[in-house]
Interface confidence: low
């Protein structure tokens, strides 16, 4: 059996070498001479020759300094043979443990660590973690037991100890209130990692902490009072530019301004934010009326796109807006005036008065009236009073100028402001009908064939309106009834049928037809009748062709 005590060997030994480690023995040496040898890593396999054994005594020796961080354990096998070379023992595994020396200092995983923390962060807030490693033995020794400390903080404001580091984990946390990005946007910490729980070898690294922005600064008006002016009646006009400063990070929601008008219930103004410089642009949302209000005193508050992170006072500004008077056009009341008048209204008589009001109550202005459009030249107006009268006879049946019994005229009113302003009104004359038109036949020229003539329908037309129209009465006069007959074509008697009583010769005839409306207004019209050389329905007769060489040209 083997006798092998536990074997350990410190790394980095000074020597001299070879140096005895242990003596191994086989209790078979009582029976005869035993010779020892070793095999394995560090003996006969690389690194070869680190360990040797005295063949006869069994002394196991190390020949050079060991490095635990390269090889921490060596596994060898011991062999024992008799003088004739026969094995007297089975090979035995030998474990050689290299014990650690503190020959490695900690190494940070980065030279510079970067972290961030929100300004105003409370004590206890975790910021970042730094990490160091140590190649030494951290199981059996403190040679790799790293402790972290902060060596320095730059700047040392507002307190020289704004941060603390967990000795064991390397987690850096806030320890003091007062982180303020606007005062100190970055901190540079020199952190140390030392082994032997902080008492041994050490190394340093840098932790750069960026203090990130929160909305802890309000936008502040500077100045807080503004004046502007705007012409009346104009929307979307820039009145003034409001200036604010905000200490928070530019072009972030904590910096971007939102303006609110506190006393604009009518929604007459609007403030938009200039995205480039955060200015507030005050504009009119709708036209203002100088005559209603000449000055507005607006109170404008400014906040940010995101809410304040802490309790902050909202900055306000006062804007005085003067409304400028502008010469406004006179306004016809009503803008469209309807007047009913009979079409036989007397020439030169006043129909109506159509006047305009002057909006500029603060300017004493004179209004002058003119007729702008009067297509039939029927009207005239008093330039001072706006009284409108007829200059010619009205005619409801003048269908070129009258539509649906309505005659439209445009009137203008001009003030004497500077510049001159003109307003327009529309006058609608609703012309009531007078029975000033007798019925007329349509058509007045009629064609019949000589042979088998077809009766012809004649419509009766009256330009007036009921009751000055149908039912009509028709009568042939001046002996026309000798050759022709008429009869009514419909119950309203708005058309008649004309036909000859006998065969007529080809030629032209005149027939006198008396037509009378429902109010007995009558009129005799001459119908021109042509009898043509044809049969049935005549259409339109062709003129008789000249005869040449005694021959009739075929039709």
């Amino acid at each position: 059996d083997w006798v092998i005590p536990p074997i350990s060997c410190p790394e980095n030994e000074k020597g001299p070498f070879p140096k005895n480690l242990v003596q191994i023995k086989s209790n078979k040496d009582k029976e005869g001479k035993v010779f020892y040898s070793i095999t394995g890593q560090g003996a006969d396999t690389p690194p070869v020759g680190v360990f040797i054994i005295e063949r006869e005594t069994g002394w196991l020796k190390v020949t050079e300094p060991l490095d635990r961080e390269r090889i921490a354990t060596y596994t060898l096998f011991s062999h024992a043979v008799s003088s004739n070379g026969n094995a007297v023992e089975d090979p035995m595994e030998i474990l050689i443990t290299v014990t650690d020396q503190n020959d490695n200092k900690p190494e940070f995983t980065q030279e510079v660590f970067k972290g961030s923390v929100m300004e105003g962060a409370l004590p206890g807030t975790s910021v970042m973690e730094v990490t160091a490693t140590d190649a030494d033995d951290d199981v059996n020794t403190y040679n790799a037991a790293i402790a972290y400390t902060i060596l320095s903080q730059d700047p040392e404001l507002p307190d020289k100890n704004m941060f603390t580091i967990n000795r064991n984990t390397g987690v850096i946390s806030v320890v003091t209130t007062g982180l303020d990005r606007e005062s100190f946007p970055t901190y540079t910490l020199v952190v140390q990692a030392a082994d032997l729980q902080g008492e041994g070898l050490s190394t340093t690294a840098t932790a750069v902490i960026t203090v990130t922005d929160t909305n802890d600064n309000p936008p502040i008006f500077n100045p807080t009072t503004y004046k502007g002016q705007v012409p009346e009646n104009e929307a979307n006009v820039v009145i003034t530019t409001l200036k604010v400063t905000d200490a928070d990070a530019p072009n972030t929601p904590a910096w971007e301004a939102v303006y609110t008008i506190l006393n604009d219930d009518g929604g007459q103004f609007v403030v938009t934010t200039n995205p480039v410089n955060n200015d507030g642009i005050l504009k009119t949302a709708k036209g203002l009326d100088f005559e209603a209000k000449q000055q507005y005193i607006l109170h404008v508050a400014v906040t940010n796109v995101v809410p304040f992170e802490v309790s902050l006072t909202t900055s306000t500004a006062t804007v005085t807006v003067d409304v400028l008077d502008v010469n406004e056009a006179p306004i016809f009341v009503p803008p469209e005036k309807r007047v009913e008048v009979s079409e036989d209204f007397g020439v030169g008589q006043e129909i109506t008065s159509y006047t305009a009001q002057e909006p500029d109550t603060f300017m004493e202005q004179k209004i002058t009236y003119r007729i702008w459009r009067d297509t039939a030249n029927w009207l005239e107006i008093n330039p001072d009073t706006g009284a409108i009268s007829t200059r010619a006879e009205l005619d409801r049946e003048d269908f070129e100028h009258v539509k649906n019994s309505t005659y439209t005229a445009l009137i203008i009113a001009t003030d004497n402001g500077s510049p001159v302003a003109t307003g327009t009104g529309t006058l609608l004359l609703i012309l009531s009908d007078v029975n000033d038109n007798a019925p007329i036949p349509e058509p007045r020229t009629i064609f019949f064939c000589e042979r088998n003539p077809k009766p012809q329908v004649i419509n009766i037309i009256d330009a007036d309106l009921p009751p000055n129209t149908s039912p009509f009465t028709a009568e042939l006069t001046h002996g026309a009834s000798a050759n022709w007959t008429i009869q009514y074509n419909d119950p309203t008697q708005e058309s008649i049928i004309l036909k000859p009583k006998m065969a007529l010769e080809v030629g032209d005839y005149k027939i006198n037809l008396k037509l009378m409306d429902n109010q007995n207004k009558d009129q005799v019209t001459t119908l021109e009748v042509s009898v043509c050389d044809c049969e049935g329905a005549a259409g339109v007769c062709r003129k008789a062709q000249p005869v040449e060489a005694g021959l009739q040209i075929p039709a």
Partner: antibody
């Protein structure tokens, strides 16, 4: 101005539970710790715990773990304390108080009296 | 937990007199990195909520009259009212805010003669 308005006084049976509310106004509710403090009649003050509405982080006095549960609702700017398994020992006035140099309490609610009686 | 002890438990003073009351902690309330003592004083008038008087041992709260003076460091602290007024009738509590759970002293009752 900062105000903390607590819910009304409660008379409850032993073994039951109660939920006290504290509505905050006049400051950024999410950015300050809300503390809860107990005061028995004629006695001193006992800190129950605190909650940070911004992220619902909370800290408790070990004595009140399991007894008090703190919650907060940012949308209504309200903090709540739920007290369970009530006994006569829980009869007290309970205050909510804003923490600023945490947990220094600069503004206090008017207090809610809880009486546990059968 | 840090234990806070106040003395005396009560005292009666006349208007205009100087009042001092003591508060001791079972461990130091001085934070070496900030050099601040994490101790506060509160005043509670009868039937009212407590009101913050002093924090960080000596910093007066908003709107607190300057007759209230906080002093001390480490484990021994004092609240002084330089010239007591009738409206100062109240209970006074000290509180450590050095570590959680924060703890209060038993209070000092100030009566006006």
């Amino acid at each position: 101005q900062v105000q903390l308005q607590q819910s009304g006084n409660e008379l409850v049976r032993p073994g039951s539970a109660v939920k006290i509310s504290c509505k905050a106004s006049g400051y950024a509710f999410s950015s300050y710790w809300m503390n809860w403090v107990k005061q028995r009649p004629g006695q001193g003050l006992e800190w129950i715990g605190q909650i940070y509405p911004g992220d619902d982080d909370s800290n408790y006095n070990g004595k009140f773990k399991g007894k008090a549960t703190l919650t907060a609702d940012k949308s209504s700017s309200s903090a709540y304390m739920h007290l369970s398994s009530l006994t006569s020992e829980d009869s007290a006035v309970y205050f909510c108080a804003r923490g600023f140099a945490t947990p220094t309490m600069d503004y206090w609610g008017q207090g809610t009296s809880v009486t546990v009686s059968s | 937990d840090i234990v806070m002890t106040q003395s005396p438990s009560s005292l009666a003073m006349s208007v205009g007199q100087k009042v001092t009351m003591s508060c001791k902690s079972s461990q130091s309330l001085l934070n070496s990195s900030t050099q601040k003592n994490y101790l506060a004083w509160y005043q509670q008038k009868p039937g009212q909520s407590p009101k913050l008087l002093i924090y960080f041992a000596s910093t007066r709260g908003s709107g607190v009259p300057d007759r209230f003076i906080g002093s001390g460091s480490g484990t021994d602290f004092t609240l002084t009212i330089s010239s007591v007024q009738t409206e100062d009738l109240a209970d006074y509590f000290c509180q450590q805010h050095y570590s959680i759970p924060c703890t209060f002293g038993g209070g000092t009752k100030l009566e006006i003669k």
